[in-house]
């Protein structure tokens, strides 16, 4: 069964990636990219660290953990359906072909709304005045449109789903962890 990580539209997504530095402060460069890990580097880089600090990042992407202790897990802020996909965490260990690379699957779920007779992907049928809100590329923002007769209150019940779940304690054993030295 495939391993994947899930978050809701509007919440923060969390993608775990860890390594154990050989010695405190002896850091290894890491890059995060969109799309599967290439042979070298990361494609579509969203964040990068060097031996000392985070030296490149893009809007909404950050490291929430203590990267100086090897927690290079990626947080993606305020996700949309367009953030669904594969993310590459690459730990750039010195030496030829020594890099450790992890492809993590992130699935973004439409935000919960009420009333909701079906999943949000079926809202077009439920509320014909509305444009479809199923995940269609980077432009979708989950706008529900003007529905004066219906009170559609967005419920934020899953703030950082994975992190708050019982799986959080097991993340370091999930495969995206390596020891250096």
């Amino acid at each position: 069964s495939e391993v994947e990580y899930r978050a809701e539209v509007g919440q923060n997504a969390y993608l775990p990636c860890f390594y154990t530095p050989a010695a405190p402060g002896n850091l290894v460069p890491v890059c995060w990219g969109k799309g599967a890990c290439p042979v070298f580097e990361c494609g579509n880089v969203v964040l990068r660290t060097d031996e000392r600090d985070v030296n490149y990042w893009t809007s909404r992407y950050w490291l929430n953990g203590d990267f100086r202790k090897g927690d290079v897990s990626l947080t993606i802020e305020n996700v949309t359906l367009a953030d669904s996909g594969i993310y590459c965490c690459r730990i750039q260990i010195p030496g030829i072909m020594n890099d450790e690379k992890f492809n993590l699957k992130l699935v973004i779920k439409p935000a919960k709304v009420t009333p909701a007779p079906t999943r949000q992907r079926d809202f077009t049928a439920a509320f014909p005045r509305m444009l479809t809100t199923r995940g269609h590329g980077p432009a979708e923002t989950q706008t529900l449109g003007s529905l004066p007769d219906i009170n559609l209150t967005q419920i934020s019940t899953l703030a950082n789903e994975l992190r708050d779940s019982r799986l959080a304690n097991d993340l370091r054993d999930s495969g995206a962890t390596i020891r250096i030295g």
């Epitope: 069964s1 994947e4 669904s84 995940g135 269609h136 590329g137 980077p138």
Partner: antibody, heavy 119, light 107 residues
Framework: EVQLQLSGPELVKPGASVKMSCKAS????????MHWMRQKPGQGLEWIGY????????KYNEKIKGKATLTSDKSSSTAYMELSSLTSEDSAVYYC????????????WGQGTLVTVSA | DIVMTQSHKFMSTSVGNRVSITCKAS??????VAWYQQKSGQSPKLLIY???NRYIGVPDRFTGSGSGTDFTFTISSVQTEDLAVYYC?????????FGGGTNLEIK
């Protein structure tokens, strides 16, 4: 490993109906919708519709609505497509495909099942 | 429905060459385009999604680019096993629609 196993080829007469199955394994069946596509001989791909096994929500391609009926069975993790009033125009390879999750690109495809409509 | 147009039905190239396949959408689809490879007698295989993101297991020689209405799929160094039909698909709106396909022939 995600796998989608389609039923075997069908040779049917014009006006008849045919029902094909797509058995899913390697993932939680109710977490993803199942899409259906077809490909006529020597032509490109055409989306038929999808079914959400979690709630039986269905959406069809308006251009070919009425031709296909989508159903699913949670207990066996199987999606079904029935094609009715078949004509030679419906001769094609039919595919089931699973999307990545709430986005309409398709990493997982069944092997295809050939439907031939001939008198 | 959004129409996806692949202007070249056939393309011919030699092993080691760089080849680019283009696809044009009838309206703005931002970067919501996927590319598939279909070898003879097989199901389509996802190569690229969201215009430029490579899927797991896809060789680095396959890349995608573009946004809005114009998209390009590139094989940096064509191999014999790349003989196939390549399709673009918009995943911006329902129904998802595919281009007519570009048949890549190896000389």
């Amino acid at each position: 490993e995600v796998q989608l196993q389609l039923s075997g080829p069908e040779l049917v007469k014009p006006g008849a109906s045919v029902k094909m199955s797509c058995k899913a394994s390697g993932y939680t069946f109710t977490n993803y919708v199942m899409h259906w596509m077809r490909q006529k001989p020597g032509q490109g791909l055409e989306w038929i519709g999808y079914i959400d096994p979690d709630n039986d929500g269905i959406k069809y391609n308006e251009k070919i609505k009425g031709k296909a009926t989508l159903t699913s069975d949670k207990s066996s993790s199987t999606a079904y497509m029935e094609l009715s009033s078949l004509t030679s125009e419906d001769s094609a390879v039919y595919y089931c495909a699973r999307d990545f999750g709430y986005v309409d690109w398709f990493p997982y495809w069944g092997q295809g099942t050939l439907v031939t409509v001939s008198a | 429905d959004i129409v996806m147009t692949q202007s070249h039905k056939f393309m011919s190239t030699s092993v080691g060459n760089r080849v680019s396949i283009t696809c044009k959408a009838s309206q703005d689809v931002t970067t919501a385009v996927a590319w598939y490879q279909q070898k003879s007698g097989q199901s389509p295989k996802l190569l690229i999604y969201s215009a430029s993101n490579r899927y797991i297991g896809v060789p680095d020689r396959f890349t995608g680019s573009g946004s809005g209405t114009d998209f390009t799929f590139t094989i940096s160094s064509v191999q014999t096993e790349d003989l196939a039909v390549y399709y673009c698909q918009q995943h911006y709106s329902i129904p998802p629609t595919f281009g007519g396909g570009t048949n890549l022939e190896i000389k």
